[in-house]
Amino acid sequence: QEEDLPRPSISAEPGTVIPLGSHVTFVCRGPVGVQTFRLERDSRSTYNDTEDVSQASPSESEARFRIDSVREGNAGLYRCIYYKPPKWSEQSDYLELLVKESSGGPDSPDTEPGSSAGPTQRPSDNSHNEHAPASQGLKAEHLY
């Protein structure tokens, strides 16, 4: 009998409110044994995959997905899904990325490092939409 896969989680570093031109990294987490993480955008057809998966703890794996220079078009809802053979998980909740006009330098975001989800995380509508990852160094060009 196939195991029930836990839903992945998604967070953003340094946070979910990012100044224009600054960087953001989406972190997708799932159980150990994940082969592929996929990061998707709500209502967008684009996605990104990565197989660069690291072990975050004895029971958890993760993949990191970095956008080097955030643009207005990067604002929106993101979610993760993972493949642990022989099947895909359900999607994570959505995480909303907000992009604001830069008031300080690119290294002075308003959000605290490590802050994530909070009020900007919302349930994912899994009724039909199943269509993004990743690891340090992996770029998010498909999601721009």
């Epitope: 967008r44 057809s45 684009t46 996605y47 899904i81 039909h128």
Partner: antibody, heavy 117, light 111 residues
Framework: EQSVEESGGRLVTPGTPLTLTCTAS????????IQWVRQAPGKGLEYIGA?????YTYYASWAIGRVTISRTSTTVDLKMTSPTTEDTATYFC?????????????WGPGTLVTISS | ELDLTQTPASVSAAVGGTVTIKCQAS??????FGWYQQKPGQSPKLLIY???KLASGVPPRFKGSGSGTEFTLTISDLECADAATYYC?????????????FGGGTEVEIK
């Protein structure tokens, strides 16, 4: 080289179940949506349905109850439960482009299905 | 289920000219949309995906535009090799399923 190829097309009599197979080569099928499309002689392209990477199956409204789509790790099957003469066509399977679900860049050559008594 | 209305059904243009093909969707599909070229006896070939992105190996003479319900394919500097039938397709698998309908096709003749 990445490819998909359809097989199973042949001449059958009306009402005879027929299964077409789309075989993936050179890539991991689990990452991709696969759609089935058909084209009757001299006519346009007609969407039949799709098997998504996450295991969902979708059908055109006209195809519900007439076909069943299923997948394994390397193939996606299209089963025609009780075909009629109107189902005579070339059947194509196609895989979506890397990084974007909106376009199908990889198509098979097609397999011809003829339904005739 | 979504309907796609493609116009015109056929068009004739001279080498070096421009052809514009339109596709209208009965519901908004954002940019979940593709354009295909098909020649007799061949499989369809992807030209445009995401409504405006050029598929690999396709010359920039082919341009897709639009989003929501109105989409356009423009072929400029026409060549004899562009004689084919062109199809649009909705590929929306978003929050609700809208099918994968194709437009009726546009036959392009090069004079």
């Amino acid at each position: 080289e990445q490819s998909v190829e359809e097989s199973g097309g042949r001449l059958v009599t009306p009402g005879t179940p027929l299964t077409l197979t789309c075989t993936a080569s050179g890539f991991s099928l689990y990452k991709y949506n696969i759609q089935w499309v058909r084209q009757a002689p001299g006519k346009g392209l007609e969407y039949i349905g799709a098997s998504t990477y996450a295991g969902y199956t979708y059908y055109a409204s006209w195809a519900i109850g007439r076909v069943t789509i299923s997948r394994t790790s390397t193939t996606v099957d299209l089963k025609m439960t009780s075909p009629t003469t109107e189902d005579t066509a070339t059947y194509f399977c196609a895989r979506h482009i890397d990084g974007d679900y909106s376009g199908y860049a990889l198509w098979g050559p097609g397999t011809l299905v003829t339904i005739s008594s | 289920e979504l309907d796609l209305t493609q116009t015109p059904a056929s068009v004739s243009a001279a080498v070096g000219g421009t052809v514009t093909i339109k596709c209208q969707a009965s519901q908004s599909i954002d940019t979940w949309f593709g354009w295909y070229q098909q020649k007799p006896g061949q499989s369809p070939k992807l030209l445009i995906y995401g409504a405006s992105k050029l598929a690999s190996g396709v010359p920039p003479r082919f341009k897709g535009s639009g989003s929501g319900t109105e989409f356009t394919l423009t072929i400029s500097d026409l060549e004899c090799a562009d004689a084919a039938t062109y199809y649009c397709q909705n590929t929306y698998y978003g929050v609700r399923y809208l099918g994968g309908a194709f437009g009726g096709g546009t036959e392009v003749e090069i004079k």
